[in-house]
């Protein structure tokens, strides 16, 4: 009598995640009586995938009607494939008994799962850095298979070269992850700049996935300070202006000091944006020179984005101006914010 053969015609099958996989198996004879079982893997640790004889396998169905005696087709279909289903599947014939005795195994069919990478997630530095410093951005994407993948970085459309990329794990796995770090040199013009991480994979049919990060989240552009005095007004008041320019982000506190004493504190809010994304702010202070005997040292103190305060001082010469008798008025805090848009 001809020896029983268990035939698995395909050495390998590749399926997209979410699709169904058909694993083919035929036997050359139904003798002796006994079940066909499907396993993933070989050896003692193999995993039972389908047993016509018994059990509940909700994702696995027989391709042909197993209740037809002349049916020698024991192919199965596994629905809703995930990367975790990858592996080598064996169709195995048993002889009925207690226990069932394994007679013959097919050669095995390797199931590989084509899984799309997750949307790339780009994260920037935890703290802001100033222009002319280099910051690192990381890009991560997970769950893809096969392992081959391409990742590119762009800043404002230009590809970055200072990049380090790793795909894990190094060995065989059901799915893979990629992590890439790009080092970006910041300039004062980068508030509106963007970095893009672009991932290309066979499952994406030439339509790469992109993750983005705005450099506005990573950059701090410190302000320029300039304190100027306007011409003396007829009422002996001097208008002193503090111009704070080209800063980012908007979080800024300005304090006026007269001879070292706090005169007024203001917080920047709802400022219009410059074309390059930075902000300008002008604050002014009216100083009644007739209320002072000596020169007045005015200081514009700016604390930007939690950084140490930056000062700019200016002396208002009082000696040149006549004193009003009995006047003890301090510098008036009636100044309003002027906003200069550049």
């Amino acid at each position: 009598e001809e020896e029983l053969q268990v035939i698995q015609p395909e050495k390998s099958v590749s399926v997209a995640a979410g699709d169904s996989a058909t694993l083919n198996c035929t036997v050359s004879s139904l003798i002796p009586v006994g079940p066909i079982q499907w396993f993933r893997g070989a050896g003692p640790g193999r995993e039972l995938i389908y047993n016509l004889k018994e059990g509940h396998f909700p994702r696995v169905t027989a391709v042909s009607d197993p209740t037809k005696r002349n049916n020698m087709d024991f192919s199965i279909r596994i629905s809703n494939i995930t990367p975790a289903d990858a592996g080598t599947y064996y169709c195995v014939k048993f002889r009925k008994g207690s226990p069932d005795v394994e007679l013959k195994s097919g050669a095995g069919t390797e199931l590989s799962v084509r899984a799309k990478p997750s949307a790339p997630v780009v994260s920037g530095p935890a703290v802001r850095a100033t222009a002319e410093h280099t910051v690192s951005f990381t890009c991560e994407s997970h769950g893809f298979s096969p392992r081959d993948i391409t990742l590119k970085w762009f800043k404002n459309g230009n590809e970055l070269s200072d990049v380090q990329t790793n795909v894990d794990p190094a060995g065989k796995s059901v799915s893979y992850s990629i992590r890439s770090t790009a080092r970006v040199l910041l300039t004062r013009r980068d508030v509106h700049s963007q970095v893009i991480c672009e991932v290309a994979h066979v499952t994406l049919q030439g339509d790469p996935l992109r993750g983005t990060a705005n450099l506005s989240e990573a950059i701090r552009v410190p302000p320029f300070l300039e304190v100027t005095q306007q011409s003396m007004r007829a009422d002996n008041q001097v208008n002193v202006t503090c111009q704070v320019t080209k800063f980012y982000p908007q979080r800024l506190q300005l304090t006026w000091l007269e001879n070292g004493n706090v005169s007024r504190t203001e917080m920047a809010s709802a400022l219009p944006e410059n074309k390059d994304g930075t902000y300008n702010w002008t604050s002014w202070l009216l100083v009644n020179v007739s209320a002072h005997r000596d020169d007045v040292k005015l200081t514009c103190q700016v604390e930007h984005d939690g950084q140490p305060a930056v000062n700019k001082s200016f002396s208002v010469k009082v000696s040149a101006h006549p004193k009003e008798q009995g006047s003890n008025t301090a510098a008036e805090n009636t100044g309003t914010n002027e906003r200069n848009i550049y």
């Epitope: 009586v33 079940p35 018994e54 049916n71 008994g97 207690s98």
Partner: antibody, heavy 118, light 107 residues
Framework: EVQLVESGGGLVQPGGSLRLSCAAS????????MHWVRQATGKGLEWVSA???????YYTGSVKGRFTISRENAKNSLYLQMNSLRAADTAVYYC????????????WGQGTMVTVSS | DIQMTQSPSSLSASVGDRVTITCRAS??????LAWFQQKPGKAPKSLIY???SLHSGVPSKFSGSGSGTDFTLTISSLQPEDFATYYC?????????FGQGTKLEIK
């Protein structure tokens, strides 16, 4: 429709012979293991004989050497040749189809009565 | 030969009851155990194979369990048409053998 119909039962004297037939319809009999099961009046079920798809035959101890199971593929029929009949062989004889890959009984005929009596 | 022992031999129950019949094999039969239902004057009907798999058309109120030597048939809610005699059978090796039967009667 899958069906099994037995015939050939009747009254026979001890030591006599009888040939039971089972006509199969709705499936190819040669593709299945086929069985004969009997039941004496008021008693339980007793497996008697089987024939495998390869023509291999099996019998219960009490009928070995006296009964012969066979099939005729052209007629899609199963037979049980019963010789040297005894009173203890009196029973309703059922033709039964074995299940696909494990031989679990799935289809039963309606039975035919065999009475061995003088 | 493998001996099959059913218990109880007879059982009285009411409509709506849940009943369990047990079957014990004299040696390990894996799960090659079948259950049959027979009504007077009729051929047996196949209910369950491989201990727990229902034949097509068999209502889900019938369930089987067990492996090795000890098996059970459970009918979850008895209906008038379920009063009959039930047999277990091992079919792991020849000669196939049946239990002596359990007669289920209306109380």
């Amino acid at each position: 429709e899958v069906q099994l119909v037995e015939s050939g039962g009747g009254l026979v004297q001890p030591g006599g012979s009888l040939r039971l037939s089972c006509a199969a319809s709705g499936f190819t009999l040669s593709s299945y293991d086929m069985h004969w099961v009997r039941q004496a009046t008021g008693k339980g079920l007793e497996w008697v004989s089987a024939i495998g798809t390869a023509g291999d035959t099996y019998y219960t101890g009490s009928v070995k050497g006296r009964f012969t199971i066979s099939r005729e593929n052209a007629k899609n029929s199963l037979y049980l040749q019963m010789n040297s009949l005894r009173a203890a062989d009196t029973a309703v004889y059922y033709c039964v189809r074995g299940g696909v890959w494990d031989d679990a009984f799935d289809i039963w005929g309606q039975g035919t009565m065999v009475t061995v009596s003088s | 030969d493998i001996q099959m022992t059913q218990s109880p031999s007879s059982l009285s129950a009411s409509v709506g009851d849940r009943v369990t019949i047990t079957c014990r094999a004299s040696q390990d039969i894996n799960n090659y155990l079948a259950w049959f239902q027979q009504k007077p004057g009729k051929a047996p009907k196949s209910l369950i194979y491989t201990a727990s798999s229902l034949h097509s058309g068999v209502p889900s109120k019938f369930s089987g369990s067990g492996s090795g030597t000890d098996f059970t048939l459970t009918i979850s809610s008895l209906q008038p048409e379920d009063f009959a005699t039930y047999y277990c059978q091992q079919y792991v090796s020849y000669p196939y053998t049946f239990g002596q039967g359990t007669k289920l009667e209306i109380k």
